[in-house]
Interface confidence: low
């Protein structure tokens, strides 16, 4: 998270770290008790690595009494990701079993109306994301709010020149933005998942490159096929 | 029409300092980055820096830290580039250059001499 | 620092050939790898963006690939005007920064 701040510990318990070998590779956030939802891009970083997901954490490194670590029994990213593009960039990872819920650990609500959100709704957006120019990566979560941009803006050529679909969402990227490590991690307006952080290598901090969203409300169908 | 179009070539002596100016037409540089980049003959690209002209932010690579400076004055729609206690390494054609995701577009080049 | 290594510094075709240059980084750039040519007392010129986005203007027969580490700008049915030379670049996502491949040029037999 750029331009953001060190989150209230444990205040998101719906915020999972998907991790390989040990580190922290993207944000993810719990949809259900046993299932959290990340990006499908995730998982190519992944390579031939044991995939994990961290729950109830606020310090990566540090021990704290809610923090545990998931094996996956299933990863399901979405049948129409594709590598070389953004669309789709959904996964489901089941966990080896249900999560201990607690007020560390906690399934957020997410959005099936499929409507736009508001422009200029601001939103929250947390991760382990990388926070400086040198790509200094945090132990401890952060967040940034920020507003979410109309899609004709995001749009124009000088933007994302057109690349943005009707299940994508922009929120603004002026200094304060999502970035590397933050990719699966949730928007969250209203206290509804509304988005998730696509893993494209898009530039970020740049006014003139917004964040790019998933809208979950349109994936609403796929979501509950595999929850079921 | 998209045009970059920089200054005159530049005969300077070791230790002094240059201004290389690039000035824009066809669009407006506030909604762009512009860019710095040297060739020194019969040699490879190597890349400057940037700067995003609507708020003067600057990123440099390292290896230029010091020895450039890059402005840009958005009245007039052009962006420089300073060097200093120039050497004989420094002799070189500069280009700058327009775009994020790639440079889409480049000036023609000052050649800089730096000769005694 | 990311290294963007141009192992061919020649490389010699004919008119008519596909000629594929390549590059390889020196770790995971995703797709964040421009191509340029640069003829002979010219400026350079964009060919690519993002590893395989053509800029308008630039003939089909040009193409690039890859992503990760390694890419490829692929030349079909060459054409005399080809004769220049191929560098490619990657930019970091954050805070842009830029390194240049050392250059690949090409000869046409």
């Known amino acids: 998270i750029l331009g953001g701040r060190e989150a209230e510990a444990h205040a998101r318990p719906y915020m999972a770290s998907v991790q390989v070998n040990g580190e922290h590779l993207c944000g993810g956030v719990l949809v259900a008790e046993q299932w959290v939802l990340s990006a499908a891009h995730c998982l190519e970083d992944a390579a031939d690595g044991k995939v994990q997901v961290l729950l109830g954490a606020h310090s990566l490194s540090q021990p704290e009494p809610s923090k545990r670590l998931y094996d996956v029994l299933r990863a399901v990213p979405h049948p129409d990701s594709r590598p070389d593009t953004i669309d789709h960039d959904l996964l489901l990872l089941q966990l080896s079993e249900k999560a201990t819920l607690g007020p560390a650990v906690r399934p957020l609500p997410w959005q099936r109306v499929d409507r736009d959100v508001e422009p200029g709704t601001l939103c929250d957006v947390a991760g382990w994301g990388i926070v400086s120019h040198a790509g200094r990566r945090p132990d401890r979560l952060q967040h940034v709010l920020l507003p979410v941009l109309d899609r004709a803006t995001c749009n124009r050529r000088t933007h994302h020149d057109g690349a943005i679909t009707q299940r994508m969402m922009c929120a603004e990227s002026n200094r304060r933005d999502s970035c590397k490590g933050d990719s699966g991690g949730p928007l969250v307006c209203g206290g509804v998942l509304e988005g998730v952080v696509t893993s494209g290598s898009r530039v970020c901090g740049n006014r003139k490159k917004p964040g790019i969203y998933t809208r979950v409300a349109s994936y609403a169908a796929w979501i509950d096929s595999v929850l079921a | 029409e998209v045009q970059l179009q920089q200054s005159g070539a530049e005969l300077v002596r070791p230790g002094a300092l240059v201004k290389l100016s690039c000035k824009a037409s066809?669009?407006?540089?506030?909604?762009?980055?512009m860019h710095w980049v040297k060739q020194r003959p019969e040699q490879g690209l190597e890349w400057i820096g940037w700067?995003?002209?609507?708020?003067?932010?600057?990123i440099y690579d390292p290896r230029f830290q010091g020895k450039a400076t890059i402005t840009a004055d958005t009245s007039s729609n052009t962006a420089y580039l300073q060097l200093s206690s120039l050497t004989s390494e420094d002799t070189a054609v500069y280009y700058c250059?327009?775009?994020?995701?790639?440079?889409?577009?480049w000036g023609q080049g000052t050649l800089v001499t730096v000769s005694a | 620092d990311i290294v963007m290594t141009q192992s061919q510094k020649f490389m010699s075709t004919s008119v008519g050939d596909r000629v594929s240059v390549t590059c390889k980084a020196s770790?995971?750039?995703?797709?964040?790898v421009a191509w340029y040519q640069q003829k002979p007392g010219q400026s350079p010129k964009a060919l690519i963006y993002?590893?395989?986005y053509r800029y308008s203007g630039v003939p089909d027969r040009f193409t690039g690939s890859g992503s990760g580490t390694d890419f490829t700008l692929t030349i079909s049915n060459v054409q005399s005007e080809d004769l220049a030379e191929y560098f490619c670049?990657?930019?970091?996502?954050?805070?842009?920064?830029?390194?240049f491949g050392g250059g690949t040029k090409l000869e046409i037999k």
């Open positions: 250059s327009r775009g994020l995701l790639g440079f889409a577009y």
């Open positions: 066809g669009f407006n540089i506030k909604d762009y980055y």
């Open positions: 700067i995003d002209p609507e708020n003067g932010h600057t």
């Open positions: 670049q990657q930019y970091n996502s954050y805070p842009h920064m830029y390194t």
């Open positions: 993002t590893a395989s």
């Open positions: 770790q995971n750039v995703g797709t964040n």
